[in-house]
């Protein structure tokens, strides 16, 4: 035998009486297939979240995050702080690249500027917080009277993290 | 949507050789940390290091360093995590994860079996 | 690096509020995350950045940071909220994330 309820469509719930008659949803709530026993109550974007997409009966309200967030998550389930350019998010707040470091995101966190010298070559644009050093060809291929830029510290291995 | 799907299942023999990949959709690949994380049969997350895609810069966690390599190929949206010598003490679930510090999707895990 | 440690399991009674901790010297300084990993499953994110509960998690998960000591509390616990829950914390020395030990929160009846 089927299911009654089945006959119900998204919109609306299967009433418990015996005529198992159709409901719409109440305000608030939605149901976004058919046969539901009960509707979900819609999804609320609230402080650092806002409406993307309002709530109707048969579907969810959608969420992303306020100007100087970003979003994190299914469905935007999260929001985390940004930064600018040439910082990283810590719990005091958006602190500056450490020298030698950048971050050429508004999120994440920085990381060490490419050592050039281990794979032959020379620095050809300094790093800066907002960007990696431009490695140029090796010092041995520099035509001579040309120069390149001291490569800065700390040095960047494969690997390691700056201490 | 975002999703990061692991290779299938692995079973080894101590000191061979093996790699595992993680593969990103959904998302900017090469601009999001990935993370990977060790769960050990029975036991709780170790998290093993993290790798920018974007120019394959890692860092690993001091009881991991030298023991795993984890790389990526931002081209097909992929990182990996290798070993060299596997050995008995490698038998784990090996998750990937976005993110370096909150991890908001995680891979479905690779079972790495190594027994002889 | 810093060293999380979780009461390897808690147990409560249906409705009654579980508490679970994760000390570590200065956590208060840093970020704590909080997942809930039931079996067979990947861990999913209950409380980030100290307290906030991300979307689709329901209200009675909530979280404080301060000190040594972050807490994960379970208010009026119900049976699905069975599951292995893990702290974390990414320390900007070492740059390295680390996890708690674990703990399983065990709902009894």
């Known amino acids: 035998l089927q299911d009654p309820c089945s006959k119900c469509p998204a919109g609306t719930f299967c009433g418990k009486n015996k005529n198992q008659i159709c409901i719409p949803c109440p305000p608030n709530s939605f149901s976004s297939t058919s046969g539901q026993k009960a509707c979900d109550i819609c999804r609320q974007c609230k402080g650092v979240f806002r409406t993307r997409k309002e709530c109707s009966s048969t579907s969810n309200a959608e969420c992303d995050c306020t100007p100087g967030f970003h979003c994190l998550g299914a469905g935007c389930s999260m929001c985390e702080q940004d930064c600018k350019q040439g910082q990283e998010l810590t719990k005091k707040g958006c602190k500056d690249c450490c020298f030698g470091t950048f971050n050429d995101q508004k999120r994440g966190i920085c990381r060490p500027w490419t050592n050039c010298s281990l794979d032959g070559k020379s620095v050809l644009v300094n790093g800066t917080k907002e960007r990696d050093v431009v490695c140029g060809p090796s010092p041995a291929d520099l035509s001579p009277g040309a120069s390149s830029v001291t490569p800065p510290a700390p040095a960047r291995e494969p690997g390691h993290s700056p201490q | 949507q975002v999703q990061l799907v692991q290779s299938g299942a692995e079973v080894k023999k101590p000191g061979e050789s093996l790699k595992i990949s993680c593969k990103g959709s959904g998302y900017s690949f090469s601009t999001y940390w990935i993370s990977w994380v060790r769960q050990m049969p029975g036991k709780g997350l170790e998290w093993m290091g993290k790798?920018?895609?974007?120019?394959?810069?890692?860092n690993y966690s001091p009881s991991f360093q030298g023991q795993v390599t984890i790389s990526a190929d931002k081209s097909i949206s992929t990182a990996y995590l290798q070993w060299s010598s596997l050995k008995a003490s490698d038998t784990a679930m090996y998750y990937c994860?976005?993110?370096?510090?909150?991890?908001?999707?995680w891979g479905q895990g690779t079972l790495v079996t190594v027994s002889s | 690096d810093i060293e999380l440690t979780q009461p390897p399991s808690v147990s409560v009674a249906p409705g009654q509020t579980a508490r679970i901790s994760c000390s570590g010297d200065?956590?208060?300084?840093?970020?704590a995350h909080w997942y809930q990993q039931k079996p067979g499953q990947a861990p999913v994110v209950v409380i980030y950045?100290?307290?906030n509960r991300p979307s689709g998690i329901p209200e009675r998960f909530s979280g404080s940071n301060s000190g040594n000591t972050a807490t994960l509390t379970i208010s009026g616990t119900q049976a699905e909220d069975e599951a292995d829950y893990y702290c974390?914390?990414?320390?900007?020395?070492?740059?390295?994330?680390?996890f708690g030990g674990g703990t399983k929160l065990t709902v009894l009846g």
């Open positions: 994860a976005r993110g370096y510090g909150i991890f908001d999707y």
């Open positions: 790798i920018y895609p974007g120019d394959s810069y890692t």
């Open positions: 974390s914390t990414y320390t900007f020395v070492g740059f390295t994330t680390v």
């Open positions: 200065n956590i208060g300084d840093q970020y």
């Open positions: 950045q100290d307290k």
